[in-house]
């Protein structure tokens, strides 16, 4: 079940997604897509970052936060009813089957007849509760010297998104975090 976020027609919608780089500048490629996260990559890609910059985007879709600090939350400008649906935020950690993928549901409501005086966004789901887990390392000893330094040990995300962290084996070593919300 996806996390649900709401916005009104004509407003900007905000879909939160964050990760904490293991070290300053250790950015991870991220993609946003319309539709549930597939096995790999993002379908109907809206925006993509690499290790340095936003290298693909489409109109109305922006990262307004500081993505260099891991804030890859998506802002959709001037939403319409057609923007309703499932969105995928994918943290593309290098390696086989390492990606963290999060499905977020956006519900667009018709604009209120009487405008709200100050509120610009309506998040009924707002920021969901967090579940923090700590990985337990593999039974075998592996040669860590050959492994990259993006390893993640702590994944913070929603209970219903946790299931299996997919950070196989030794990707649990560095103190970085991933979360949505």
């Amino acid at each position: 079940s996806e996390v649900e976020y709401r916005a009104e027609v004509g407003q900007n919608a905000y879909l939160p997604c964050f990760y904490t780089p293991a070290a300053p500048g250790n950015l991870v490629p991220v993609c946003w897509g319309k539709g549930a996260c597939p096995v790999f990559q993002c379908t109907n890609e809206l925006l993509r970052t690499d290790e340095r910059d936003v290298n693909y985007w489409t109109s109305r879709y922006w990262l307004n936060g500081d993505f260099r600090k891991g804030d890859v939350s998506l802002t959709i400008e001037n939403v319409t009813l057609a923007d309703s649906g499932i969105y995928c935020c994918r943290i593309q950690i290098p390696g086989i089957m390492n990606d963290e993928k999060f499905n977020l549901k956006l519900v667009i409501k018709p604009a209120k007849v009487t405008p709200a005086p100050t509120r610009q966004r309506d998040f009924t789901a707002a920021f969901p509760r967090m579940l923090t887990t700590r990985g337990h390392g593999p039974a075998e000893t592996q040669t860590l010297g050959s492994l990259p330094d993006i390893n993640l040990t702590q994944i913070s995300t929603l209970a219903n998104e946790l299931r299996d962290s997919r950070l196989a084996n030794d990707l649990r070593d560095s103190g970085a975090t991933i979360r949505i919300g």
């Epitope: 490629p29 790999f40 290790e51 390696g95 089957m97 039974a139 592996q142 330094d149 299996d164 196989a168």
Partner: antibody, heavy 118, light 113 residues
Amino acid sequence: QVQLQQSGGGLVQPGGSLRLSCAASGFTLSSYAMSWVRQAPGKGLEWVSGISGSGGSTYNADSVKGRFTISRDNSKNTLFLQMNSLRAEDTAVYYCAKIFGSYYFDYWGQGTLVTVSS
Amino acid sequence: EIVMTQSPDSLAVSLGERATINCKSSQSVLYSSNNKNYLAWYQQKPGQPPKLLIYWTSTRESGVPNRFSGSGSGTDFTLTISSLQAEDVAVYYCQQYYSGPPTFGQGTKVEIK
């Protein structure tokens, strides 16, 4: 030492099913992601399917999506590939492979031949 | 997905001579944050499963003779056999494990001239 012993291959008609097994020894299966890689006769290597250490997440190549299911029984230290709706183009030697830390395939099974033919 | 292309498809080298195999990826497999190239090389002899030779572009797997070496970065990689031995006759594959499904080159067959 690490060993991956495969079984379950054979001749099957198009549309049929087969289940491949890969019995692991020398390491704890639940600590490692695993994959199946196939090789059509006289051709190169093609990744088919993968599964996380706990078995909670599975991944399939587009060519087998909806037809093949990878699973594991960690209590028996065994990896499986259930192959349904088999096609002639699925004819290949299938290898199970251990993934070292989500990066590369450090140990391979001996391979088992799957032939799909009428 | 990342496409891996090897050259040449086959290679005949005299015993004791150098053999060089090239591998090119359709996009970079270098992760700049750790300066590692997510590329491995495998050797497959007839009737046998592939065997890991080299990972992280240039790190030899335990037990692999030091006549095998790997180099390159980004999208262009090379496997070199410095002095070909009879037991090196095989097909060699490169593989990326940077993103998406792991993908292999089409293979290079090394024979003795």
